[in-house]
């Protein structure tokens, strides 16, 4: 239904809490250098002016698109240029041109410095002074450095950071109160923050269709009882909330999503069995719960499929006549049979039929062409199976920090060119995998592993497209979202790149590495074994265990040493001697 | 080719216990059901038991707290322990696998409780 004021509207039905704190990420999400006091003002600003509304909607400006208030506001900003260069140029265009251009301009790496938590402390004691403005801070601050977070999940993960702050604060020793319970907020929304970003990459780079795939997959799985038609409902309002928080319409995405909810709760009879707990939890609660609802029990005696879709004499006309319908029966009924298989896969088998269709639907005797596509899936599964197994199989012998390693070594091979940061990187992230995913039930692996490398490859795609390096890596970047993870699984070493030249400063190390936590350590141990790749693309794995093995020794004597420095200085080049020897 | 063959059954006094087990041979993949089910003379075939790929267990109302079925994925297999047995409870009992492009059985293997 339309509303006399948009602004008014949305104020009203998300309160003024949930509406402040969506304004500052919008604005954070798109002004990404703004300091976190020039934002507040705007927020400030923007909710006196929707408050007018409320009182009277028929004043000035109220009638105004939330667009057309937000861009208005951003183009106000003084030295604009100065601090954002081009992205001024989008002040020039009307709407709905300039958010999309506002949009266009919002960066993936955002030059930042890593967002360093307080100690304990002093946390609280700002915590205490004014939770309303440490709660701000918390919302820019990870808003700007993750321009697409999900931004009702963001106010949800706020909220538990506010929670925990409430709880430790009050204990003795703050620290080891605080520290575990944030640093598990800190993973779960940095996992939030990639998964996210591939829904906007699909939503942005494919369309709604393919969004709506994914979701009719991933609906199918957790609900296996719902029918076709439930399903897609609930795929067509999840597409819309976030084609609208992709598309920074954040007050829209947050209103829709409590609504999807509601619904979600009001229906479970037709839904899930499962959803009754998530349902007696408040708003913020009750949306996550139900993002990561467990699968329903899947219905005992689902028949098999090849009579509706391979044996029936009327699958090409049922194609033909409703092909997007057909395609999404298709996926509806597969992916609620197996609940182990990750979305990717099963909308690569999706695919795969719908290729076979399209070619045999033209043919002479279509049945016996489309005859065999069943059993043409098996490969297709089995692949992922075997990555799977295989990973699984090594993480479990080296541990996270050597698995890290062994995928740094693959992927500089495949990459070479790609910038060492951005390798190490993505080495870390992928080799969290193992922890993440090897450690489930079985028919949990697969889809745990293949949907969280698909979105961490998903970033190494983002942040290759801004400085282009590696032929491998646009290939396998300009496909499909569903193919990317095959393609980075099947580069093999990178037969073109000629070798880095040997600098010893590349391996020169002094001895404040003694003093860093042990996190940054290993990224300075990463990003020497990724350079010595870069040196040497062919070393076998015995060689650069060797020299990182003499590596890690060497870091050991040094920072037991009573002298450091001279320990450094003296040892460091025997070091580069030997490495440049065991690699020779 | 798919086969299937169960084994384990025979005669049994009321109150005993049974293990049938169900192996395929032959190239089957994407399991997502394995069930038993049995037909008693004159009777339509009804299921007992199945398992998902999920692990979920469902058991028909007459069976529930004596039967327990289970399953090795490793080498598809599946198995049906079957105890406090009752004269009600013979039948040919049929192994039953599926997978997206088809349905899979056994020959079936006779149990009879009597006394």
């Known amino acids: 239904e339309a509303h006399k004021s948009e602004i008014a509207h949305r104020y009203n039905d998300l309160g003024e809490q949930h509406f402040k704190g969506l304004v500052l990420i919008a604005f954070s999400q798109y002004l990404q250098k703004c300091s976190y006091d020039e934002h507040a003002k705007l927020v400030q600003e923007v909710t006196d002016f929707a408050k007018t509304c409320v009182a009277d909607e028929s004043a000035a400006n109220c009638d105004k698109s939330l667009h057309t208030l937000f861009g208005d506001k951003l183009c106000a900003i003084p030295n604009l240029r100065e601090n954002y260069g081009e992205l001024a140029d989008c002040c020039t265009k009307q709407e709905p041109e300039r958010n999309e251009c506002f949009l266009q301009h919002k960066d993936d790496n955002p030059s930042l410095p890593p967002f360093e938590r307080p100690e304990a402390e002093a946390m609280c004691t700002s915590f205490k002074e004014n939770p309303t403005t440490f709660m701000g801070h918390y919302l820019h601050e990870v808003a700007r450095r993750h321009p697409y977070f999900y931004a009702p999940e963001l106010l949800y993960y706020a909220e538990q950071y506010n929670e925990i702050l409430t709880q430790c604060c009050a204990e003795a020793d703050k620290e080891s109160c605080l520290t575990p319970k944030l640093d598990g907020v800190k993973e779960k929304a940095l996992v939030s923050s990639v998964r996210q970003r591939m829904k906007c990459s699909s939503m942005q780079k494919f369309g709604e269709r393919a969004f709506k795939a994914w979701a009719v997959a991933r609906l199918s799985q957790t609900f296996p009882n719902a029918d076709f038609a439930e399903i897609t409902k609930l795929a067509t309002d999840l597409t819309k909330v976030n084609k609208e928080c992709c598309h920074g319409d954040l007050l829209e995405c947050a209103d829709d999503r409590a609504e999807l909810a509601k619904y979600m709760c009001e229906n479970q009879a037709t839904i899930s069995s499962k959803l009754q707990t998530c349902c007696d939890k408040p708003l913020l609660k009750k949306a996550h719960c139900l993002s990561e609802v467990e699968h329903d029990t899947m219905p005992a005696d689902l028949p098999a499929i090849a009579a509706d879709f391979v044996e029936d004499q009327e699958v090409c006309k049922n194609y033909a006549e409703a092909k997007d319908v057909f395609l999404g029966t298709f996926l509806y009924e597969y992916s609620r049979r197996h609940p182990d298989y990750s979305v990717s896969l099963l909308l690569r088998l999706a695919k795969k039929y719908e290729a076979t269709l399209e070619k045999c639907c033209a043919e002479a005797n279509p049945p016996a062409c489309y005859g065999t596509v069943l059993a043409e899936f098996q490969p297709l599964v089995e692949e992922p199976k075997n990555l799977v197994k295989t990973n699984c199989d090594l993480y479990e012998k080296l541990g996270e920090y050597g698995f890290q390693n062994a995928i740094l070594v693959r992927y500089t091979q495949k990459a070479p060119q790609v910038s060492t940061p951005t390798l190490v990187e993505a080495a870390r992230n992928l080799g969290r995998v193992g922890t993440k995913c090897c450690t489930l039930p079985e028919d949990q692996r697969l889809p745990c592993v293949e949907d969280y490398l698909s979105a961490i490859l998903n970033r190494v795609c983002l942040l290759h497209e801004k400085t282009p390096v590696s032929e491998h890596v646009t290939k396998c970047c300009s496909g499909s979202l569903v193919e990317r993870r095959p393609c980075f699984s099947a580069l093999t070493v990178d037969e073109t790149y000629v070798p880095k030249e040997f600098k010893a400063e590349t391996f020169t190390f002094h001895s404040d590495i003694c003093t860093l936590p042990e996190k940054e350590k290993q990224i300075k141990k990463q990003t020497a074994l990724a350079e010595l790749v870069k040196h040497k693309p062919k070393a076998t794995a015995e060689q650069l265990k060797t020299v990182m093995d003499d590596f890690a020794q060497f870091l050991d004597t040094c920072c037991k040493a009573a002298d450091k420095d001279t320990c450094f200085s003296t040892e460091g080049p025997n070091l580069v001697t030997r490495c440049k020897d065991a690699l020779a | 080719q798919v086969q299937l063959v169960e084994s384990g059954g025979g005669l049994v006094q009321p109150g005993g216990s049974l293990r049938l087990s169900c192996s395929a041979s032959?190239?089957?993949?994407?399991?997502?059901?394995m069930g038993w089910y049995r037909q008693a003379p004159g009777k339509q075939r009804e299921l007992v038991a199945s398992?998902?790929?999920?692990?979920?267990?469902h058991y028909a109302d007459t069976v529930k707290g004596r039967f327990t079925i289970s399953r090795d994925n490793s080498k598809n297999m599946v198995y049906l322990q079957m105890n406090s047995l009752r004269a009600e409870d013979t039948a040919v009992y049929y192994c039953?696998?599926?997978?997206?492009?088809?349905?899979?059985w056994g020959q079936g293997t006779q149990v009879t409780v009597s006394s």
């Open positions: 398992i998902t790929v999920d692990g979920s267990t």
């Open positions: 039953d696998i599926r997978n997206v492009g088809g349905d899979y």
């Open positions: 032959g190239s089957i993949w994407g399991i997502y059901h």
